[in-house]
Amino acid sequence: IWELKKDVYVVELDWYPDAPGEMVVLTCDTPEEDGITWTLDQSSEVLGSGKTLTIQVKEFGDAGQYTCHKGGEVLSHSLLLLHKKEDGIWSTDILKDQKEPKNKTFLRCEAKNYSGRFTCWWLTTISTDLTFSVKSSRGSSDPQGVTCGAATLSAERVRGDNKEYEYSVECQEDSACPAAEESLPIEVMVDAVHKLKYENYTSSFFIRDIIKPDPPKNLQLKPLKNSRQVEVSWEYPDTWSTPHSYFSLTFCVQVQGKSKREKKDRVFTDKTSATVICRKNASISVRAQDRYYSSSWSEWASVPCS
Amino acid sequence: VPGGSSPAWTQCQQLSQKLCTLAWSAHPLVGHMDLREEGDEETTNDVPHIQCGDGCDPQGLRDNSQFCLQRIHQGLIFYEKLLGSDIFTGEPSLLPDSPVGQLHASLLGLSQLLQPEGHHWETQQIPSLSPSQPWQRLLLRFKILRSLQAFVAVAARVFAHGAATLSP
């Protein structure tokens, strides 16, 4: 058993039929010695008396808020949560496996630049009685500070018969060094509590591996005289790290016909302009990627050819 | 470059960008099978990293690029030695046309651009690489190339910025 926060405790249980469970001793936080009784949740049934209560925790029915009283007065509470371990693996019932980029990916994180700011998000089908707490650091043995905000519900989607809820959190490395080569990964730890079930999820990454620039901005077309060619120009996204002579991007320009089946013409360039042939009813799209490190491409910025 | 003269920024920029491309093309091609063996006894934690105080940020380069260039040079020599070690020359054999060969030669080329014949910087003591057990090599190759990708990305940014702002 360990303390998650004040008066909230997590009991780690091997979860299998007829498992013996864990013996837990609760102590009433009071100077009083006599006349103390214990109850669980809203029940008035007295579970025991005395300053300590010993219980065998085997299932969710044994978890919940234990309260010690004296003469009708509440002295203290202890909330017991269960963390299940099945076949040596901690349960992951609360969050959905996003399966990207690989199986057992529960947390996904992205950064728009090298400033040390990043966003993580996760998915669940649970709508109520759900709380999240997020901690982060750079490295684990001698951790350096990363400050995370509160997790918030950022999107709701309908998936077949189910509703899916997306939560996200923003974090900022306290002393970020954008130009350095990271040697220790960022660690992100999410505590999830649903009713009386506790689970924890972790992710470890380098900022460089989660970079995804915003799409190029101010995408414009300039027709070239007496030609079907156009000059496409764009700018670095505002959110990208500066100076751009140091934090350089590379770009992919694509000409796409109306039909998805039509052949796409693609040009790669380090410049912020390119000359392409504009076909009728086609659109021109541009996306960006770090020039020197193959992290994710940005989403496309698009304009119609007409 | 040692002693404060300026490197051939544009040449270094071109070669470091080529290094980035090679490091990424070499990465998936380092062995005969998936990385099933997660033996982590020998990791690559002792590789030199370009750290915050090394002056490789735009301001540090403007103030005095020598600290940063020396750090890059140390790293290039270190990785060049690693790519010539039995981790890469031993079994499973890399194909003759593997990008690792070009990557190796380019590391040497860039380090020579930074330190021409007859000039000498203090080079960091290269740890004597004890022979790697063959079963560890795939994992070590994978880790070394991952870490090299990060190193050459920073080096390429340095040379791109230098070529754009510090070239005579």
Epitope: - | E91, P96, G101, W135
Partner: antibody, heavy 115, light 107 residues
Framework: EVQLQQSGPELVKPGAAVKMSCKAS????????IHWVKQKPGQGLEWIGY????????KYNEKFKGKATLTSDKSSSTAYMELSSLTSEDSAVYYC????????WGQGTTLTVSS | DIVMTQSPATLSVTPGDRVSLSCRAS??????LYWYQQKSHESPRLLIK???QSISGIPSRFTGSGSGSDFTLSIDSVEPDDVGVFFC?????????FGGGTKLEIK
Amino acid sequence: EVQLQQSGPELVKPGAAVKMSCKASGYTFTRYLIHWVKQKPGQGLEWIGYINPYNDGTKYNEKFKGKATLTSDKSSSTAYMELSSLTSEDSAVYYCTSNWDLDYWGQGTTLTVSS
Amino acid sequence: DIVMTQSPATLSVTPGDRVSLSCRASQSISDYLYWYQQKSHESPRLLIKFASQSISGIPSRFTGSGSGSDFTLSIDSVEPDDVGVFFCQNGHSFPFTFGGGTKLEIK
């Protein structure tokens, strides 16, 4: 065509030393290891050790430490093995081979130690 | 050291037979196993690398299988030219060790 050409047979007296060679051609000599293997007449194969011609790094079978010394010369793409304090137990065919998975083997050097 | 044990020591077969040669490692070597054939007065020749990967120029009747500590070299339809001694080798860890060999004879 890849070839590992080994030096000719040797007849030496007990207590003496011998240095045999293995000249590589048809590939970049520094790209792969050179292993040395011993085979006594009518018997199995024993690994002696290897040299990395790129950096002259070596790895020996404990059993052959002090007996065999591996060296190489990049300029001539040649690997060498010196065997010292020879006894009749050292009489064998000695093969050089590149990485095991490449199947580049020398033809073998026959060493006879006899007074 | 990893001990490589081959069986049988000698195998006498008729041309056209399918034969299996066994090799056992004293501890797991994953798939870091090589098979060689050595004909009389010749250098060894690599038949199979990494337990089951074929080698260009080697007839397809030679196949390898196994992983961990038990390995098999199979010859689909033995030909008279296949005579010789077959060795397996641990390529997993130092020191590299060879099996004692299986001698293949034609009846």
